[in-house]
């Protein structure tokens, strides 16, 4: 999670603000070692499909679940805030039986009115035998999935089936797709916002509307900020992810809802069932679709996708392949930036953003998606930095 893509050696952790490396034992120890203090504000994460709250222990140099003993909602809100979620997004906290854990972080209630992490200490016991599960935002819930769902080879989507899907317009024309992750933040592809389209004033986001012809100016949300991944490579499409912040927050309803960002510890399986959606062309070199379409695809393991007869080592760890090697179903022009989602525990997770491919729906040329799992830390950092 935190340590992915770091240029420090295995034992070091990189400061965002200066690029310097610090010792893991100095991370989350209550003292700022990075110039921007980020070694003390990235000490919390949600783990696995049950959203188990974990805190980094500088003593043990590892992550540990938080014991439910003496925990309350206020601590939950503080933890979510530290991840980059706003207070008013907070959804709920729950408890998960975690008898499998042998190492916990516990609250020292007598520690007084200090920072939450200064109240936590390492313990091998947890009397409640339960750990904290946190939902920082009510995400990943839809009304009804699509029928066997044109992208290329799909079908038109049902209302509320993909409520996180947005259409991103430039001068009243659909250019890319995107995914809602909070009322203010949209995930899209970096190649969508290459210069000169890196200016936010170019962009309007439309949410909850299935038909392009209903997307008139007044129903859209103006974009306030565009943040492209700093390591995006326009030639190879490596790190093809970007964030858009909206000027006004979206109002969530049955048709407009966020998708969940994947948590560390969520294992993706080869052949795992996923869905893609968008207003992209329904055939190669076709024009943008009037209606939102969706299609089922399967994850294709990177080793296979990198084989000589598929993409011959063009797939990096920041990419995921999905589709069918026989072709027929795929994302296409105009779907870029849109979601690749999968369902686990009845929750929909954003595991990819539509990035590139050779043609559309061709045999041995599956779709390639940004691997959102690799970018979650970067996403939370942007949300946190924006305050």
């Amino acid at each position: 999670w935190k340590f992915m893509g770091s240029k420090c050696s295995n034992s070091g952790i990189e400061c965002d603000s200066s690029g310097t490396c610090i010792n893991p034992s100095n991370w989350c120890d209550g003292v700022s070692h990075c110039p921007g203090g980020e070694d003390e504000n990235r000490c919390v994460r949600l783990y696995g499909p049950n959203f188990i709250l974990q805190v980094y222990s500088s003593q043990r140099k590892s992550w540990h679940p938080v014991c439910q003993d003496d925990w309350n909602e206020n601590y939950g809100r503080a933890a979510c805030r530290d991840m980059g979620y706003k207070n008013n997004f907070y959804s709920s906290q729950g408890i998960v039986d975690d008898s499998g854990s042998t190492s916990f972080m516990k609250l020292n209630t007598s520690a007084g009115n200090v920072d939450i992490y200064k109240k936590l200490y390492h313990s091998d016991a947890c009397s409640s035998k339960a750990v904290v599960s946190l939902r920082c935002i009510a995400c990943g819930v839809n009304l009804n999935s699509s029928r066997q769902s044109r992208i290329v080879g799909g079908e038109s989507a049902l209302p509320g089936a993909w409520p996180w899907q947005v259409s991103l317009h430039v001068q009243n024309v659909h250019v890319c797709g995107g995914s809602i992750i909070t009322p203010e933040w949209i995930v899209t592809a970096a190649h969508c916002v290459e210069k000169p389209l890196n200016n936010p004033w170019h962009w309007t986001a439309f949410a909850g509307i299935l038909r392009q012809s209903f997307m008139f100016y007044g129903a859209g949300y103006q974009v306030e900020k565009v943040i492209s991944h700093p390591n995006y490579d326009s030639k190879t499409k490596n790190n093809d992810i970007a964030l858009m912040k909206l000027q006004k927050p979206l109002t969530f309803n049955d048709l407009v809802k966020p998708v969940c960002l994947p948590n560390p510890g969520m294992m993706l399986q080869p052949e795992q069932l996923c869905w893609i959606s968008g207003w992209g062309a329904t055939e190669e070199k076709g024009k943008t679709s009037e209606v939102l379409n969706a299609a089922k695809v399967l994850l294709i393991e990177t080793q296979r996708c990198n084989s000589r007869y598929v993409y011959d080592n063009l797939i990096t760890p920041a990419m995921i392949c999905a589709g069918f090697l026989q072709g027929n179903v795929d994302s296409c022009q105009g779907d870029s930036g849109g979601p690749l989602v999968t369902s686990k525990n009845n929750i929909w997770w954003l595991i990819g953003d539509t990035s590139w491919g050779s043609g559309c729906a061709k045999a041995y040329r599956p779709g390639v998606y940004g691997n959102v799992m690799v970018f979650t830390d970067w996403i939370y950092r942007q949300m946190r930095a924006d305050g």
């Epitope: 209302p159 509307i209 209903f214 007044g218 129903a219 309803n253 049955d254 407009v256 009037e290 209606v291």
Partner: antibody
Framework: QVQLQQPGAELAKPGASVKLSCKAS????????MHWVKQRPGQGLEWIGL????????NYNEKFKSKATLTVDKSSRTAYMQLSSLTSEDSAVYYC??????????????WGTGTTVTVSS | DIVLTQSPASLAVSLGQRATISCRAS??????????MHWYQQKPGQPPKLLIY???NLESGVPVRFSGSGSGTDFTLNIHPVEEEDAATYYC?????????FGAGTKLELK
């Protein structure tokens, strides 16, 4: 059940303005756009415009752009239409109607009861 | 704007017979596999009531004697067999794009 309630009648003088209301109940207010339709006595239906309760930015029929102003109050789940500079041509029944913008369809599945506006000195 | 022309303007039909109302659009209202044409019934002093959506789909609670057909620019509403309560004005409406527009209406009377 799903309802759109409108006052039965409004009387106004020429040159004046009138503000019509449409109170929604029985559904998620922000999941539907609210449209307004005019019907002159013995005449057909004329689309005035729509307002998305989410963003509050309206879309109008060119013919009514300087005549009608659409607004919403999300807290009271009420849509409003103000008609200005009234003339006898504005005497009509005005309906609000909801439109499920999230479906592909674009039909009016629920209509208000209608408000009869009479412009007379 | 798309103009919808309904015909006839009025028609009188005997009880139990078939009523056929036509609606022609100035340009195609079909795209992406859908025909964005809808039909409404309006009785005096009442708001319009949705009968048929997407050219041929019967709205729930509407009797099966009402049916719709057509695609592109030509659409038809059929009522068979006509019953007494069907005396009303019928309107077509498109939603191919904004603005949506209505036909001028067809008044159905019973002989």
């Amino acid at each position: 059940q799903v309802q759109l309630q409108q006052p039965g009648a409004e009387l106004a003088k020429p040159g004046a303005s009138v503000k019509l209301s449409c109170k929604a109940s029985g559904y998620t207010f922000t999941s539907y756009w609210m449209h307004w339709v005019k019907q002159r006595p013995g005449q057909g239906l004329e689309w005035i415009g729509l307002i998305p309760p989410n963003s509050g930015s309206s879309n109008y029929n060119e013919k009514f752009k300087s005549k009608a102003t659409l607004t919403v109050d999300k807290s009271s789940r009420t849509a409003y239409m103000q008609l200005s500079s009234l003339t006898s041509e504005d005497s009509a029944v005005y309906y609000c109607a909801r439109w499920d913008y999230g479906s592909s369809y674009g039909y009016f599945d629920v209509w208000g009861t209608g408000t009869t506006v009479t412009v007379s000195s | 704007d798309i103009v919808l022309t309904q015909s006839p303007a009025s028609l009188a039909v005997s009880l139990g017979q078939r009523a056929t109302i036509s609606c022609r659009a100035s340009e195609s209202v079909s795209t992406s596999g859908y025909s964005y044409m809808h039909w409404y019934q309006q009785k005096p002093g009442q708001p319009p009531k949705l009968l048929i959506y997407l050219a041929s789909n019967l709205e729930s609670g509407v009797p099966v004697r009402f049916s719709g057909s057509g695609s592109g620019t030509d659409f038809t509403l059929n009522i068979h067999p006509v019953e007494e309560e069907d005396a009303a004005t019928y309107y077509c409406q498109h939603s191919r794009e904004l603005p949506p527009t209505f036909g001028a209406g067809t008044k159905l009377e019973l002989k």
